[in-house]
Amino acid sequence: QRLPRMQEDSPLGGGSSGEDDPLGEEDLPSEEDSPREEDPPGEEDLPGEEDLPGEEDLPEVKPKSEEEGSLKLEDLPTVEAPGDPQEPQNNAHRDKEGDDQSHWRYGGDPPWPRVSPACAGRFQSPVDIRPQLAAFCPALRPLELLGFQLPPLPELRLRNNGHSVQLTLPPGLEMALGPGREYRALQLHLHWGAAGRPGSEHTVEGHRFPAEIHVVHLSTAFARVDEALGRPGGLAVLAAFLEEGPEENSAYEQLLSRLEEIAEEGSETQVPGLDISALLPSDFSRYFQYEGSLTTPPCAQGVIWTVFNQTVMLSAKQLHTLSDTLWGPGDSRLQLNFRATQPLNGRVIEASFPAGVDSSPRAAEPVQLNSCLAAGD
């Protein structure tokens, strides 16, 4: 399926799982992009923000003395509450341990900026992508993924951290956004809605998709997540929209079939390694890119977001399993775990393809509203 008003030949899908290529062009700041900390009640019941370590849980942050230079690829780091000892953290949701910064939730108190001041920053994520306003940037080359086809053993940790379902990735998954822009994958997690209600974090021309996958990466310039937080390009997230299609997605089924085992908040299981790239669209050449933030506290900025133009297709049953199996804090279903879109505040979203123009043969050099900043500069 295509996004609203998307050019006909820009399938936001057609990827590894028969997706449609729905993203067109990028997103300029707009009035309706006025800053919001969380989803105003009423905007599709949008929850607040995402669960990265702040993007879900980033890999554990280890004290420097322990495993210096090595990274535990588990939960993304959560923000340390003022005065908290710098202890290694296993996951972002630590209510029972009294870490103030784990006391956040979607669509409610406390306001996220109180949890982490960065959540009130000017360059936050997610955003609404407007293909017509995206800057076509030919310098954005196809993404390169290496080592994403994991063998079944060793097994991987799949965890319900109360904010999302997160798969911790082993060392060795390398991703390049371009020459000299190299990253290592840490974890992936999903965002979803509820019955009949979409739950992607990013939107395209205001259209929200059923769900969204995020694969979180750490720049090879940093040994630890806590060193990279807030640094431009320190973290990079690959994001893809999940849509309903006619067939079961066998790659996703390897994870979705295990959700019942981790229905309870804080529970985890082990799953066989799988081809992580099969969870993403097949077209690595067409995407949108912008600099934003983690979508959950600590909301650290400087995160490079790459949003695939192609979507991934899951069956209706699979999307239902995703949105209706897990439980979060306070005996409530884990649903609508997405943050409201944030204002661009002057940011220009770049596109690796001419997303805002009919790309049929008759179109010569498309005229773009925004010009591209050379990637990697």
Epitope: P151, P152, S250, P272, L274
Partner: antibody, heavy 124, light 107 residues
């Protein structure tokens, strides 16, 4: 040499319980996941389940056909793996094999060492 | 669950023949497939792992090939001791599943 020796089979009535044992020798038992595979008379092989090693938390995994009725456990100090079968049904009648498969150095589950098998007959 | 379909279900062959047994898998399992040999009254024995790797002690006349959803076990020159039932097994994800077996008989 590397071997798995099984015991505990026999005739049992439907609804009753039985425990199979599998004693390992000749290899570092703690490194491995231990599986159970069964074969109904004249039929093919069916995976029953496995138990992970200590490094992976000793957690078990079961096939849908036995989940909730069978329990796999292990005693590393005795190098024994167990299959506790409760609420047995006539369709559980089979030769049960204890199998070694999967450890820190392997990259998927293949079954390289098999016990001699023990027949479990569920009949009234 | 991943379905495994072997073909043929049975075949007759003579000593010295070249024999191939196929295993079709319902979804992509990369190379995470093993082959086993079982003789009557005995436990199965591992022949091939990771689609094409020969297990220790297995004669070199046995070989395996394939990846994704199609796999083949080949016996280059059939010997009398090779008459048995052969099973393929996927080790990509649980529940681990086996093919229904191929019975190799003397012609």
């Amino acid at each position: 040499q590397v071997q798995l020796v099984q015991s505990g089979g026999g005739l049992v009535q439907p609804g009753r319980s039985l425990r199979l044992s599998c004693t390992a020798s000749g290899f570092t038992f703690t490194d491995y996941y231990m599986h159970w595979v069964r074969q109904a008379p004249g039929k093919g092989l069916e995976w029953v389940g496995f138990i992970r090693n200590k490094a992976s938390g000793y957690t078990p995994q079961y096939s849908a056909s036995v989940k909730g009725r069978f329990t796999i456990s292990r005693d590393d100090s005795k190098t024994i793996a167990y299959l506790q079968m409760n609420s047995l049904k006539t369709e559980d009648t089979a030769v049960y094999y204890c199998v070694r498969g999967g450890h820190a150095g392997s990259n998927y589950w293949y079954f390289d060492v098999w016990g001699q098998g023990t027949l479990v007959t569920v009949s009234s | 669950d991943i379905q495994m379909t072997q073909s043929p279900s049975s075949l007759s062959a003579s000593v010295g023949d070249r024999v191939t047994i196929n295993c079709h898998v319902s979804q992509n399992i990369n190379v995470w497939l093993s082959w086993y040999q079982q003789k009557p009254g005995e436990a199965p024995k591992l022949l091939i792992y990771q689609a094409s790797n020969l297990h220790t002690g297995v004669p070199s006349r046995f070989s395996g090939s394939g990846s994704g959803t199609g796999f083949t076990l080949t016996i280059r020159s059939l010997q009398p001791e090779d008459y048995a039932t052969y099973y393929c097994q996927q080790g990509q994800s649980y529940p681990f599943t086996f093919g229904q077996g191929t019975k190799l008989e003397i012609k």
